[in-house]
Interface confidence: low
């Protein structure tokens, strides 16, 4: 999947079709039982808004351990004292006080906008994800199409999308480029990364969700 | 008003190498969003996607034709390229350049160019 | 890769018909599905993305209907231009994969 922010989609974004369960053989970029059908189903309470996108987070974190599983398997990256030497080379989204996530100054509206941001920023990551994985090539697809799935949601839940800044497609682009010309170490490391700060990013969004 | 326009040898002999270019007016191949396609049809009416080179430069192909394939381009000519070694009769086909905006569609198509391969 | 297979792979129809093309992909592709049309000779030209959204000045004619797996190409009151064979794309990932066609002919 080559897409770098959600600014590329045409007028219907991909609208809700995304919802739809993929092939047992394929992970879904939802839950399993988050199917349209089933969420409509007389005999199960449909989920609110709230629950699927807590439900939807905790289903990309279990991707994610799935990936970072691989990763330190293949490599001694996830020991590594050497982090901070290919973090410099990285712009990865961190929460900070002044985004209003956490229990100290929460803020829901400012908070909103960081999480969609982050996540529309952690998009080009993701993709550059994608052909990093062999046995777990499919858990990255999953990861990287929930995690649109998730963006899709939450802009529903966002009441002031004008604060939400799309990452410029040319940027990442060439951000893209770069990060793939690295050499094998730092293109491990760089992975390993990505996993670990989406991980942190994405716990530390449950967290102040769910405070929503 | 944006237009492709492909250009190569039409008859190549096997194992020998096909270069077809394509010439793009209209928008710089270096524009935001796009990527820029080859894709060929062969007799019976059959696409097949080979790859595509994004704005930036950077380039996915098809896995099944990696191994024969390069695209490269050129921003100052404003063309982007595609070289096919070790042809045979099964890469006789009309090979389309295209323009798609990433996740979106292919809006532009070049009018194709025939390619024979045969001794 | 995914299979992308359409029906009928020719039809004949007269104009002022309606007609419709199905599309059904081997794996989920939610509505990452593109139509096109292609006339004798010509290149490919786009009619609907999306699964279905009509491309710029395609006439309302025509309508793409599913996600998922399961996609069709409806075209109402067929006019003399509609003739000619339409291909499903989909661009879920790579590689790209097409279906093998659907010739629509004058009756």
């Known amino acids: 999947m080559n897409s770098f922010s959600t600014s590329a989609f045409g007028p219907v974004a991909f609208s809700l079709g995304l919802l739809l369960v993929l092939p047992a053989a394929f992970p879904a970029p939802v839950p399993p039982g988050e199917d349209s059908k089933d969420v409509a189903a007389p005999h199960r309470q449909p989920l609110t808004s709230s629950e699927r996108i807590d439900k939807q987070i905790r289903y990309i974190l279990d991707g994610i351990s799935a990936l970072r599983k691989e990763t330190c398997n293949k490599s001694n990256m996830c020991e590594s004292s050497k982090e901070a030497l290919a973090e410099n080379n990285l712009n990865l989204p961190k929460m900070a006080e002044k985004d209003g996530c956490f229990q100290s100054g929460f803020n829901e509206e400012t908070c909103l906008v960081k999480i969609i941001t982050g996540l529309l920023e952690f998009e080009v990551y993701l993709e550059y994800l994608q052909n990093r994985f062999e046995s777990s090539e499919e858990q990255a697809r999953a990861v990287q199409m929930s995690t649109k799935v998730l963006i899709q949601f939450l802009q529903k839940k966002a009441k002031n999308l004008d604060a939400i800044t799309t990452p410029d497609p040319t940027t990442n682009a060439s951000l893209l480029t770069k990060l793939q010309a690295q050499n094998q170490w730092l293109q491990d490391m760089t992975t390993h990364l990505i996993l670990r700060s989406f991980k942190e990013f994405l716990q530390s969004s449950l967290r102040a969700l769910r405070q929503m | 008003d944006v237009q492709l326009q492909e250009s190569g040898p039409g008859l190549v002999k096997p194992s020998q190498t096909v270069s077809l270019t394509c010439t793009v007016t209209?928008?710089?191949?270096?524009?935001?969003?796009?990527?820029w396609s080859w894709i060929r049809q062969f007799p019976g009416n059959k696409l097949e996607w080979i790859g595509y080179i994004y704005y930036s430069g950077a380039i996915t192909y098809n896995p099944s034709l990696t191994s024969r394939t390069t695209i490269t381009r050129d921003t100052s000519m404003n063309q982007f390229f595609l070289e096919m070694i070790s042809l045979t009769a099964e890469d006789t086909a009309t090979y389309y350049c295209a323009r798609d905006r990433y996740d979106y569609a292919v809006d532009f198509w070049g009018q194709g160019t025939s390619v024979t391969v045969s001794s | 890769d995914i299979q992308m297979t359409q029906s009928p792979a020719s039809l004949s129809a007269s104009v002022g018909e309606t007609v419709t093309i199905t599309c059904r992909s081997s794996e989920n592709i939610y509505s990452f599905l593109t139509w096109f049309q292609q006339r004798q000779g010509k290149s490919p030209h786009l009619l609907v993305y999306?699964?279905?959204t009509l491309a710029e000045g395609v006439p309302s004619r025509f309508r793409g209907r599913g996600r998922g797996t399961q996609f069709s190409l409806q075209i109402n009151s067929l006019q003399p231009e509609d003739f000619g064979t339409y291909y499903c794309?989909?661009?879920?990932?790579?590689?790209?994969?097409f279906g093998g066609g659907t010739r629509l002919e004058i009756k």
């Open positions: 794309q989909h661009h879920y990932g790579t590689p790209w994969t």
């Open positions: 209209g928008i710089s191949i270096t524009t935001g969003n796009y990527r």
């Open positions: 999306y699964a279905n």
